[in-house]
Interface confidence: low
Amino acid sequence: RGVFRRDAHKSEVAHRFKDLGEENFKALVLIAFAQYLQQCPFEDHVKLVNEVTEFAKTCVADESAENCDKSLHTLFGDKLCTVATLRETYGEMADCCAKQEPERNECFLQHKDDNPNLPRLVRPEVDVMCTAFHDNEETFLKKYLYEIARRHPYFYAPELLFFAKRYKAAFTECCQAADKAACLLPKLDELRDEGKASSAKQRLKCASLQKFGERAFKAWAVARLSQRFPKAEFAEVSKLVTDLTKVHTECCHGDLLECADDRADLAKYICENQDSISSKLKECCEKPLLEKSHCIAEVENDEMPADLPSLAADFVESKDVCKNYAEAKDVFLGMFLYEYARRHPDYSVVLLLRLAKTYETTLEKCCAAADPHECYAKVFDEFKPLVEEPQNLIKQNCELFEQLGEYKFQNALLVRYTKKVPQVSTPTLVEVSRNLGKVGSKCCKHPEAKRMPCAEDYLSVVLNQLCVLHEKTPVSDRVTKCCTESLVNRRPCFSALEVDETYVPKEFNAETFTFHADICTLSEKERQIKKQTALVELVKHKPKATKEQLKAVMDDFAAFVEKCCKADDKETCFAEEGKKLVAASQAALGL
């Protein structure tokens, strides 16, 4: 409602159109529709968006016009349900259209597919892209939004507008350059990699909200914002957490117009209150809106205030601990988390949340005891092993990464995770292990004080990918257990898994290990994926194979590919040498 609180907006769609402007309105509606109907052709979505936009304009002109008072879910849902091919394209998703709001929107959300059956995006020649960009810039950029949104149905919509702005800037600059490819391709690679990372980070936020509830998300936000803004008062952090929770709840719920609007509001508030939030925001706040919001989200941690008192005084030594806890449990725990996090930028958010959970469990037990103070006096001692576990794990894995390099480190993780959860599909194991392996180059270069927040919070994002992909087609009780029991203990849960002794090895299939000359034309990355796919399959056939056995087979395989790619008759080489390799591998592994 407005400041004057006369009444709610007569027309929500007109309100959002006026707030966001036509360009952002159309882009956000396109993203919303593409995230819901992931298989629909681009042209169909553009038509739907244009119809919604024209309708919104009539409501701006006259808010009392017919249907202008309907909710955005009703308007958008009605529009999606006009798609003629809904039943044949989406099957049971069409049943959503028989429901009323809000159940209909919930139904659409449940049918979002994290792994849609869509062709891989192939990048055309630079000249082809530049011609398309110059011929119709608007369509070119809409196509970008559409292709990303349908493949990443939880992509943070206002951030996708920022990516599109950078995408446009790259083409505007590089299509005029002397060497278009040298200018454009690195920029597109950077956008692709950043986009994948952004999508995965947002997917964790949505999973946190949807699977573990608002309280879990708010706890995460208190910890992260307290690390980032350690000079801010608890009340200020609480306000930011409330606003941030609203923004992400809206985006994860498909309310993209409200989400973008509220995110702009939040960025504005933060910039107007920099003095009471952080000294690091100045540069961010001088940027235009999309850049500003992105910059704030990535801003470095402010310096910790000097002379912060010991935590023990308020949270252990005070005789009022149980009284304060009983009066307002979540506020007291929030203050504990805030005070601990602002003192520990060197801890991961998930570690801070584990400590807060341990503290909460201790108070629940001790505040009901005969002598509460005596009972909780040693609570901080319980934190030591919780802190040491990720520290040791990161130390060991960084040493292994430095010894092996990224590709071989990924292979070590592939073997490790395939042995833990061999039922998981090979493409998922390859994707997840490759991403887990990237933690080395991403985080091991950092000094000790930055390693844990970098590594463990990144691993949370990657393991969430495993969880959402596995949820679509569950095959392993162990994965389900680690994914659903505790959000903050997912990584320790997976780390603790040993080889699955109940697994019945996969039948040997020579076809899986048959390769052709097309492997020679692949990029280095795609060739690695082929080899890593073969490695996972080997482990599934022979889960008890030793590291040495697997290394020998993989070395033979690499030599075989190199030899045949240099041969004159590549296809014959792959056929003949391939048979020899399979026989040798079977012998080496005792298959």
Epitope: R6, H15, A264, D265
Partner: nanobody, 115 residues
């Protein structure tokens, strides 16, 4: 569109008080936030105070404790009570409003603090 008209400016001595008013008309139901800004001669426009849709207010340190923003819903009017005025508060004061950011502006009212 939203129309905003400020009033209440004038000459006041250091340490004195003034109350500025801003009357809003037009599509005011779309307004989520209202604010006061000021611009001294030869200087950039500066944020003075804001009241959001929820009634929360904020001020920069330069006016905190001296200025108070408030509103009267029944009259669609925004106020700025200015106490302990200083010479450096001399400026044209603008009322601003909008759904997300302050996109509608008044013409301004001049406040001069001088002995």
């Amino acid at each position: 569109e939203v129309q905003l008209v400020e009033s209440g400016g004038g000459l006041v001595q250091p340490g004195g008080s003034l109350r500025l008013s801003c009357a809003a008309s037009g599509s005011i139901e779309s307004i989520n936030r209202m604010a006061w800004y000021r611009q001294a001669p030869g200087k950039q426009r500066e944020f003075v105070s804001r009241i959001s849709k929820g009634g929360s207010t904020n001020y920069p340190d330069s006016v905190k404790g001296r200025f108070t923003i408030s509103r009267d819903n029944s009259k669609n009017t925004l106020y700025l009570q200015m106490n302990s005025l200083r010479a450096e508060d001399t400026a044209v004061y603008y009322c601003a409003a909008g759904p997300v950011w302050e996109q509608f502006w008044g013409q301004g009212t001049l406040v001069t603090v001088s002995s």
